[in-house]
């Protein structure tokens, strides 16, 4: 149950620490220089100095020859300098630059399109199931169930706007109260952060790149989880979100507004609608207990239809079921009444690939899921490659300085808030926090943006997506305006509250430290990234869902001991790192626990054995497949022929290099094992030949 620390020999030393501003970290040397580092697992470990946890940027002063894996890499420019080129070379270089820019924009376009298709694929695979989650009556009384339903539905449909719109329609139809909807919205906020975490997994080929990318993506997850952890109990106790938003909605006389501008969709829709088009109303109908919707396909077949309102005669069990007494009659045997029906006449079929295949939703979804992940991965690799070739030397320095440097004193604190505004603005433009954070992930991976800077951008993205929802709410029809606006405002104030909790004071920026901790673990044990994804986005929500269905007694009976153990472990961990002398000798470290409970090494052995069968089979496969293989089996030799996972990793496998790392990983999340034994970076873990 405990984290995996092996900290018997760690001694606190409050005198030795460095304070560094976010984004002003020294840059690490060239990757190529790191390859000659040796590794000896049995070597004595450099003592790690533990520090008071009051700044996110506090680093441990380690031997100077060791590099911090969180330092941004220097992307060396190996090409000929501009001044040394002749006219022909300059023209060629210029056109190469233009070509790269076009390619970059092209791959970025297909990257965004593949995210859209990925969302459609998830909806086809799990949309109906997601809709059924909503039809659970216990949501009304159990906020925890509402929360996990929000997570699961958003993960299943890969779109917080879809799950939010279902909630809005349920509130408008009085199937759900605003009070019951708030935890679902919180859950949707968590669920939407899975997309960029999936994108981060695509950068698994390079350990140091993966460390940064995964941490950069999961900073969003941790922010959302921590916000919920604090704000859900507060909301349940005080209903502050409900009260504030109700006051706002009631004090303003809103007129129906215009629809939120679809800026990115305008560009991507022409392509994505050729792949697949979905009838998203089906999920909402299932959520609202429409039995007929359960048999409907999500794949849109008819795009042009004519709706004709007509009256038809229908039989009813008795005259009491008649529309009105005057519209009631009998044929002598059965009672009849007149019903208004909307008759839909199909005029023109949609023009997408799957329109004439008549495949089940699951089949279409699976095909699209595989294809979109492949395209997503391929585009990401190409984006990283192009950015890697563009962002070298001076260009990289300028960009990195522009993005990561703070304003001059005394306005340095304003930089982060500007980043929040930028994140919000960018998200408002692209109309999707998933797209924005997913685009940010590879930039964090290749070292253009620091996690410290990505954090406020991500927080801004969370705000941006709620402003879009507010605009969409203002464009709602009269009956849905109040409920949709109140829910959109709840979403907005929840994110504002989260920012107030986890951003203004550097000490409270826990998500950064937790994400870096997870990044370190995942860089060492890459399977842990998938494990984290499954646990946090599927298993925990599904377990809570299952326990909630069993009844609140079962939920409390299981939940309370689990929460108690977690708190106990955290308290013990804190005491071990701050004042171990208070504790009995046995409890001063985790050595009293069996190895499997305090280290990932035994688990790694199990995973390696389990994935061993994949190791030999994935040779000579395409680069994308190889990356997936490397992610699954963490194999150093498996893809030698495609040069994807270099033999170089063999040399780094057993390294034990002490690193300079933010002190709180050691205090809270992460062991020496994950910290110290992770190589600073990989050299060439990407395929050289595409």
């Amino acid at each position: 149950m405990a984290p995996w620390p092996e900290l018997g020999d760690a001694q606190p030393n409050p005198d030795k620490y460095l304070e560094g501003a976010a984004g002003q970290q020294p840059t690490a040397p060239d990757k190529s220089k790191e390859t000659n580092k040796t590794d000896n697992t049995e070597a004595p470990v450099t003592k790690i100095e533990l520090l008071p946890s009051y700044s996110t940027a506090t680093l441990i002063d380690e031997p100077t020859e060791v590099d911090d894996p969180w330092n941004l890499p220097t992307l060396q420019d190996s090409g000929i300098k501009w001044s040394e080129r002749d006219t022909k070379g300059k023209i060629l270089c210029f056109f190469q630059g233009i070509g790269r820019l076009i390619l970059l924009l092209g791959f970025l376009y297909f990257f965004v399109c593949s995210l859209d298709i990925l969302s459609s694929a998830f909806q086809l695979v799990g949309g109906k199931m997601a809709g059924q989650f909503f039809s659970n009556s216990s949501i009304m009384s159990n906020p925890l169930l509402g929360l996990v339903i929000g997570v699961l539905v958003t993960v299943l449909v890969q779109s917080s706007s879809t799950s939010t719109s279902i909630v809005v329609s349920m509130v408008s139809s009085s199937l759900l109260t605003v009070r019951a909807a708030i935890p679902i919205i919180m859950g949707a906020n968590i669920g939407t952060s899975i997309t960029n975490t999936i994108v981060a997994l695509m950068q698994v080929g390079d350990r140091s790149e993966f460390r940064r990318a995964f941490a950069g993506a999961t900073v969003h997850d941790f922010f959302n989880w921590l916000s919920v952890l604090v704000l859900l109990p507060v909301e349940v106790a005080t209903h502050y979100l409900e009260i504030i938003t109700q006051l706002i909605v009631e004090s303003f006389h809103f007129k129906n507004g215009e629809d939120a501008p679809d800026l990115l969709k305008v560009i991507t829709k022409p392509f994505t609608k050729l792949i697949v088009q979905l009838d998203k109303k089906v999920i909402s109908q299932i959520a609202m207990n429409d039995e007929k919707a359960k048999n409907k396909s999500l794949v849109k077949i008819w795009c042009k239809t004519f709706t004709n309102k007509t009256q038809i005669n229908v039989t009813v069990p008795s005259t009491a079921n008649c529309t009105s007494p005057s519209l009631c009659w009998t044929d002598g045997i059965q009672n009849w009444t007149m019903k208004n029906v909307t008759y839909k006449e199909n005029i023109a079929k949609c023009q997408h690939i799957f329109v004439n295949f008549h495949l089940p939703d699951l089949a279409v979804g699976t095909i699209l899921l595989i294809l979109s992940l492949l395209v997503l991965c391929g585009c990401l690799i190409m984006i990283v490659k192009i950015l890697g070739s563009v962002l070298k030397g001076q260009v990289a320095t300028v960009i990195k300085k522009t993005i990561n440097t703070d304003f001059p004193f005394p306005f340095a604190w304003l930089t982060g808030y500007l980043a929040i505004l930028v994140g919000a603005g960018m998200t408002f433009i692209v109309q999707s926090s998933s797209v924005f954070t997913s685009a940010l992930t590879p930039l964090i991976g290749i070292g253009v943006i620091t996690i410290e800077r990505a954090y406020p951008l991500t927080l801004g993205s969370n705000i941006g997506t709620t402003t879009t929802a507010i605009l969409a709410a203002l464009a709602s029809p009269g009956n849905a305006l109040r409920s949709s606006l109140q829910i959109a405002l709840c979403h907005f104030f929840f994110n504002i509250s989260g920012i107030l909790l986890w951003y203004p004071i550097p000490f409270t920026r826990l998500p950064i430290r937790m994400a870096k901790g997870l990044g370190n673990i995942s860089a060492k044990y890459r399977w842990f990234a998938v494990f984290y994804l499954i646990i946090f986005f599927f298993l925990i929500p599904l377990t809570v869902f299952g326990l909630s269905l069993a009844g609140w007694r079962v939920l409390v009976g299981v939940g309370v001991p689990v929460v108690f153990i977690i708190i106990l472990v955290l308290c013990l961990r804190l005491l071990q790192s701050r004042c171990p002398r208070v504790l009995p000798k046995k409890l001063q470290n985790w050595n009293f626990l069996p190895l499997w409970m305090r280290s990932l090494k035994p688990w790694d052995a199990v995973v390696s054995k389990f994935t061993g069968c994949f190791q030999m089979r994935c040779c000579c496969c395409c680069r994308v497949c190889c990356r997936a293989c490397c992610l699954l089996c963490d194999c150093p030799k498996c893809c030698r022929c495609s040069k994807c996972c270099e033999d170089l990793e063999e040399a780094q496998e057993g390294q034990d290099v002490p690193v300079k790392a933010p002190e709180t990983f050691d205090n809270i999340t992460i062991s020496r094992e994950a910290q110290g034994e992770v190589p600073a970076s990989d050299s060439k873990t990407e395929c050289t030949a595409l």
């Epitope: 005057s326 519209l327 009631c328 009659w329 009998t330 044929d331 002598g332 045997i333 059965q334 009849w336």
Partner: antibody, heavy 119, light 107 residues
């Protein structure tokens, strides 16, 4: 064209039963209800009940409940109406009539069967 | 049961006259009313259903109107073949009931 041909006149003693048949043609037998209406000499029309040949479902006027039985034979497209415990006031012309689909108006009628009840 | 009160019971008219027959329902029947024509020794014949809709093959001199509880049957210009007995019928609820009839005679 739609045709409804009823069985011939019947003379019955009080307490006896009578079974009148109505053979249909010219339409799909199982789609429309078949009504039975009687008319006492010099009197108005009185609805006895109806049968839906498609399922055999029936509905009877409360006045005749327990005394009337309606059946349908889909193989011969014929409906039958049996009235038991006959009384002298049951003397009337009995008509079968096809109900229009979806409502209780009767568009085609049989020629009628005179049932006389006398001792 | 719903009572259908038809008036008048007897009606004398000449060829070319406009005649109206009234039928009153004891409760609201909407428009679930039909009108029939019966000649002596013959079966009834459907003329109007849904209070206003003419059955196929019925001349347009026959028309119906009304809803709720009051219904009117009109022959705009009586023809020699129109002299017969006319019945109204409600099919709003079971049992189906008929009016007592109106006998149209030659004046």
């Amino acid at each position: 064209q739609v045709q409804l041909v009823q069985s011939g006149a019947e003379v019955k003693k009080p307490g006896a039963s009578v079974k009148v048949s109505c053979k249909t043609s010219g339409y799909t037998f199982t789609t429309n209800n078949m009504h039975w209406v009687r008319q006492a000499p010099g009197q108005g029309l009185e609805w006895i009940g109806a049968i839906y040949p498609g399922s055999g479902a029936t509905a009877y006027n409360q006045k005749f409940k327990g005394r009337v039985t309606m059946t349908a034979d889909t193989s011969t497209s014929t409906v039958y109406m049996e009235l038991s415990s006959l009384r002298s006031e049951d003397t009337a012309v009995y008509y079968c009539a096809r109900g229009m689909y979806g409502h209780g108006a009767m568009d085609y009628w049989g020629q009628g069967t005179l049932v006389t009840v006398s001792s | 049961d719903i009572q259908m009160t038809q008036s008048p019971s007897f009606l004398s008219a000449s060829v070319g006259d406009r005649v109206t027959i009234t039928c009153k329902a004891s409760q609201d029947v909407g428009t679930a009313v039909a009108w029939y024509q019966q000649k002596p020794g013959k079966s009834p014949k459907l003329l109007i259903y849904w209070a206003t809709t003419r059955h196929s093959g019925v001349p347009d001199r026959f028309s119906g109107s009304g809803s709720g509880t009051e219904f009117i049957f009109t022959i705009s210009s009586v023809q020699p073949e129109d002299f017969a007995t006319y019945f109204c019928q409600q099919y709003s609820s079971n049992p189906l009931t008929f009016g007592a009839g109106t006998k149209l005679e030659i004046k």
